[in-house]
Interface confidence: low
């Protein structure tokens, strides 16, 4: 019993839960291959619990290892378009500061209009997760085609 | 050394470690887009543990934040195949109670033959989880192709 | 306070909290359809805490549910490599001991060269995980585009 | 102190050329893109070019393009802006600043300025 | 090319009083508008970017605030170090442009 009470009095940060899920608010300038993301309660079924939001971009807030996935779906996309505009790339990496910048997760739409993974990965408070498409092809805003999250999973 | 005990004495429930990995049953009937589930040790790999299942769908029994993943493979497919069956897609929403229906995930097969995400989203105790499968191709009932799952992350 | 000093004084693999991500070492010699992964922060990202390599392969070593998640890229390749050399499929299995052989999750590449998935599933201290790439093409060892790991997610 | 020194401004005629230097200090300069900015007197701003972080990649304002180039030691810490076949209408305040992001985020950093005057 | 136009061109106000300042893009540019006080004889000098967000430095008397093309900058209570020109700049597309500024006065 002790433990259950424990438990509730303590603040979830404090056991490290950081979570976060997001949807897509919108694509980058021309040349900056950044997808910009948004969150919260009143945009639908997206959140943050600790990680944050800078620019559209997201910044991890405690050192561990995350859970990080991603799911995006191109707009207007057939196998046809997909291929004919090959490549379409999506990577999703370190971003800040940037003389850590490394890419921890890579993937081309081929044939394919959607892609979808995830992978664990150590991430240090202060990172900046940044998500960049290349390619002419845009991506759909679509809460259930494109989403990007990450879990904090251990230390 | 408390900890651990307290730990032990408590039912793994009441951590809130709600989990289920679900195997293909059936499809529906004409009309009805829904893949029905099963689970439970007697059948190899699934399991429920916190959610059950209610006529072969997975209704939750803990709010939280869920990660819910799925991969479901077309059965006779090829590449060829699943082109000229497009568009073949797989929703998972929340179709119980209806007032919070809602698509949650969603891809389409294009030219492959198997699909395959996960996502972050918060869940209410009550929920029902609904896989629907549109198009005129039949999923794999092979547990290693086809397969649906939950997992409690936080509340 | 008592939790949390409970919780800081207990090692983290008390809390059961296993993880591993893995990076590509080398495909096997001809007629080992086997991958072999290897792990440590002297590779980069990659890490073990718990689990534990034997010959290039995951053993577990503790009793749970997991989450096993899979990301291939094959090398040089592109949709039409991809469908000229078909059937490749990737399976992740149970391949020691030998007689709880069997395979967890499988994947076809079709007309793409990545393919990504997870899965839940029970896992038993001494499990060895094999990941088979079969068909001639050969799999990326890009660490962003080919890993392959597990999360200890409850007893 | 985070800072930026522009240099080589001064008067020149027409159809001639000229080099502008800006160095930087106080920040890890190859992690920046690098803009140039320009003022004609009694004006507003008016972007001319940019170079990335790794000078992978270099964009011109149509009114420079062809006549100006944008280059940077990353080793030295400077970036630079060769201007070609000057114009009386290149006349201006031209300032350096750092790009906030790396790729084309605000301005967050400025020089003081250094001044060109195009005249025969 | 994207044009900004800003109004009003000229303003004139007093120490303590709430001015806006609005900029207009020809076509979308998302999030991507960064305002700049200059002063005679001076750089530029950044107050908001990304719409919205102050930098470290920046008085919290000043905002920003808008999205697609119609953006505003406000300045709750003036201060007589506000006196000055300010431009808003564009960083969706090539080339990156400006508006031509607002002279803000004192009365």
């Known amino acids: 019993q002790r433990f259950a009470q424990a438990q509730q009095q303590l603040p979830l940060e404090s056991l490290g839960w950081d979570v976060a899920e997001l949807q897509l608010n919108h694509t980058g300038p021309q040349q900056d291959p950044r997808l910009y993301w948004q969150g919260g309660p009143a945009l639908g079924r997206s959140f943050l619990h600790g990680p944050e939001l800078d620019k559209g971009q997201l910044r991890i807030h405690r050192d561990g290892i995350y859970m990080v996935h991603i799911q995006v779906t191109l707009a207007i996309c057939s196998s046809t378009t997909a291929s004919r505009h090959h490549p379409t790339t999506l990577a999703v990496g370190i971003c800040s500061p940037a003389s850590r910048s490394i890419s921890l997760l890579r993937l081309s739409f081929h044939q394919g209009c959607t892609i979808a993974s995830q992978r664990l990965t150590p991430l240090a408070r202060g990172d900046t997760l940044c998500t960049n498409l290349t390619g002419t092809l845009l991506p759909s805003r679509n809460t259930d085609e494109t989403f990007f999250g990450v879990q904090w999973v251990r230390p | 050394q408390r900890f651990a005990q307290a730990q032990q004495q408590l039912p793994l429930e009441s951590l809130g470690w709600d989990v289920a990995e679900l195997q293909l049953n059936h499809t529906g009937p004409q009309q009805d887009p829904r893949l029905y589930w099963q689970g439970g040790p007697a059948l190899g790999r699934s399991f429920l543990h916190g959610p059950e299942l209610d006529k072969g769908q997975l209704r939750i029994h803990r709010d939280g934040i869920y990660m819910v993943h799925i991969q479901v493979t077309l059965a006779i497919c090829s590449s060829t195949t699943a082109s000229r069956h497009h568009p073949t897609t797989l929703a998972v929403g929340i179709c119980s109670p209806a007032s919070r229906s809602i698509s949650l995930l969603r891809l389409s097969f294009h030219q492959g033959c198997t699909i395959a995400s996960q996502r972050l989203t918060p869940l209410a105790r009550g929920d029902t989880l609904c896989t629907n499968l549109t198009g005129t191709l039949l999923p794999s009932r092979n547990t290693d192709e086809t397969f649906f799952g939950v997992q409690w992350v936080r509340p | 306070q008592r939790f949390a000093q409970a919780q800081q004084q207990l090692p983290l693999e008390s809390l059961g909290w296993d993880v591993a991500e893995l990076q590509l070492n080398h495909t096997g010699p001809q007629q080992d359809p086997r991958l072999y992964w290897q792990g440590g922060p002297a590779l980069g990202r990659s890490f073990l805490h718990g689990p534990e390599l034997d010959k290039g392969q995951l053993r577990i070593h503790r009793d749970g549910i997991y989450m096993v998640h899979i990301q291939v890229t094959l090398a040089i390749c592109s949709s039409t490599t991809a469908s000229r050399h078909h059937p490749t499929t990737l399976a992740v299995g149970i391949c020691s001991p030998a007689s709880r052989s069997i395979s967890l999750l499988r994947l076809s590449f079709h007309q793409g060269c990545t393919i990504a998935s997870q899965r839940l599933t029970p896992l038993a201290r001494g499990d060895t995980l094999c990941t088979n790439l079969t068909g001639t093409l050969l799999p990326s060892r890009n660490t962003d585009e080919t890993f392959f790991g597990v999360q200890w997610v409850r007893p | 102190e985070v800072e930026l020194v522009e240099s080589g401004g001064g008067m020149v005629q027409p159809g001639r050329s000229l080099r502008l230097s800006c160095a930087a200090s106080g920040f890890t300069f190859s992690d920046y893109g690098m803009h140039w900015v320009r003022q004609a007197p009694g004006m507003g701003l008016e972007w001319v070019t940019v170079?990335?972080?790794?000078?992978?990649?270099?964009y011109y304002a149509d009114s420079v393009k062809g006549r100006f180039t944008i280059s940077r030691d990353n080793s030295k810490n400077t970036v630079f802006l060769q201007m070609n076949s000057l114009r009386a209408e290149d006349t201006a305040v031209y300032y350096c600043a750092r790009d906030e992001v790396g790729f084309v985020g605000a301005f967050d950093i400025w020089g003081q300025g250094t001044m060109v005057t195009v005249s025969s | 090319d994207i044009q900004l136009t800003q109004s009003p061109s000229f303003l004139s106000a007093s120490v303590g009083d709430r001015v806006i300042i609005t900029c207009r893009a020809s076509q979308g540019i998302n999030s991507h508008l960064a305002w700049y006080q200059q002063k005679p004889g001076k750089a530029p000098k950044l107050l908001i970017y990304?719409?919205?967000t102050l930098p470290s430095g920046v008085p919290s008397r000043f905002s920003g605030s808008g999205s697609g093309t119609e953006f505003t900058l406000t300045v709750t209570s003036l201060q007589p170090e506000d006196f000055a020109t300010y431009y808003c700049?564009?960083?969706?597309?090539?080339?990156?442009?400006f508006g031509q500024g607002t002279r803000l006065d004192i009365n």
């Open positions: 170079i990335w972080y790794d000078g992978s990649n270099k």
């Open positions: 990304y719409a919205s």
């Open positions: 700049q564009q960083l969706n597309h090539y080339p990156i442009t």
